[in-house]
Amino acid sequence: ARNGDHCPLGPGRCCRLHTVRASLEDLGWADWVLSPREVQVTMCIGACPSQFRAANMHAQIKTSLHRLKPDTVPAPCCVPASYNPMVLIQKTDTGVSLQTYDDLLAKDCHCI
Amino acid sequence: ARNGDHCPLGPGRCCRLHTVRASLEDLGWADWVLSPREVQVTMCIGACPSQFRAANMHAQIKTSLHRLKPDTVPAPCCVPASYNPMVLIQKTDTGVSLQTYDDLLAKDCHCI
């Protein structure tokens, strides 16, 4: 269940997809990746207020219990709901290979 | 990839399964659930320090970028890796039904 997409905190403040530009050095990949030199990393960032993009029943429970016991139970967290694949040209023992990674770039986001 | 399970912050401080006792009232379920009256809710709580239980490549990227840009990129978050099913006896228009929910109780946790 994807609950409300209206952010009560104001535009762009709630859980959504952001793009962060990162170099191979930033990512700690310079020793094993040749290309790309820079990645447009898509990730899920933002607050998860009550029922905003609740991924499932567990997220709804978490919201309820966070309201009751905020020091014990954290609010739901903004995480990827799915991913976009990406290829890397990576060094191997013998040269290079083109490798596909399915879990690298967030495609869309939800709260859990 | 499940990375290190050693918590550098001290025992029990990092992402792991916790049990929180909650009543139907706590959960906001009193008007549609008859049983159980109380649920042992298992949920994922705790910090996600560098590479601790990293769910995938995305989590590893997030760790690297959080270290570089802590104000922009949040640390990975402790969320369910899988769920245990649970049945609820719930009210219906005509009486009651026994309904299974697959996404209600966390089974184990990882950082993402």
């Epitope: 040749l34 790309p36 976009n84 694949p85 290829v87 040209i89 083109l98 596909t100 | -």
Partner: antibody
């Protein structure tokens, strides 16, 4: 496994538009870093890069041919199309499409011969 | 556009010999040079990436080196299946450009 197949008319008249399609399998053009390129080879001559299109729809063209070229993709059909307008005999060549991962062209189709003649 | 000048345009050699092909770029391309093999009636096969990195599955008798403007491709011990045309290509900037090719023939 990765496969690419070029298809085209075989024979085109001078001044007409050449339309080629590359149909591929084994990879997706929605994958970050993936592209499809076109390369041609006139009979008995060397290779000439024509154009390529990326996963994000960015397009790059051979400088000399740019004004005559159109490239497009249909990600759902796993196809890339190339159009070359106002053809002359100098455009007679075997046309190849190739999968690209950034600046690697690692898999090529078997090529399709296009002859420009009236 | 960057011009890639390959030499020689052809060479004759025997099985077991060492073969060296050179490629010169008209401007600095760092290490962004690839090498391809093409047999008659076939499509090119990708061999070397970024001057010196062998692609997956390419035998280690094939090697490359160089940076800036001068690049070398070597077959350490030519095998019967290696007789073909070899092309260099710069992948430093678009438009990507190829060398004219070197035909490796049996002596």
């Amino acid at each position: 496994q990765v496969q690419l197949q070029e298809s085209g008319p075989g024979l085109v008249k001078p001044s007409e538009t050449l339309s080629l399609t590359c149909t591929f399998s084994g990879f997706s053009l929605s994958t970050y870093g993936i592209g499809v390129g076109w390369i041609r080879q006139p009979p008995g001559k060397g290779l000439e890069w024509i154009a390529h299109i990326w996963w994000n729809n960015n397009k790059y063209f051979n400088t000399a041919l740019k004004s005559r070229l159109t490239i497009s993709k249909d990600t759902s059909k796993n196809q890339v199309s190339l159009k070359l307008s106002s053809v002359t005999a100098a455009d007679t060549a075997v046309y190849y499409c190739a999968r690209m991962g950034y600046d690697i062209m690692d898999y090529w189709g078997q090529g399709t011969l296009v002859t420009v003649s009236s | 556009d960057i011009v890639m000048t390959q030499s020689p345009s052809s060479l004759s050699t025997s099985v077991g010999d060492r073969v060296t092909i050179t490629c010169k770029a008209s401007q600095d391309v760092n290490t962004a040079v690839a090498w391809y093999q093409q047999k008659p009636g076939k499509s090119p096969k990708f061999l070397i990436y970024s001057s010196s990195y062998r692609y997956t599955g390419v035998p280690d008798r094939f090697s490359g080196s160089g940076s800036g403007t001068d690049f070398t491709f070597t077959i350490s011990s030519v095998q019967p299946e290696d007789f073909a045309v070899y092309y260099c290509q710069q992948h430093y900037s678009t438009p990507w450009t190829f060398g004219g090719g070197t035909k490796v023939e049996i002596k």
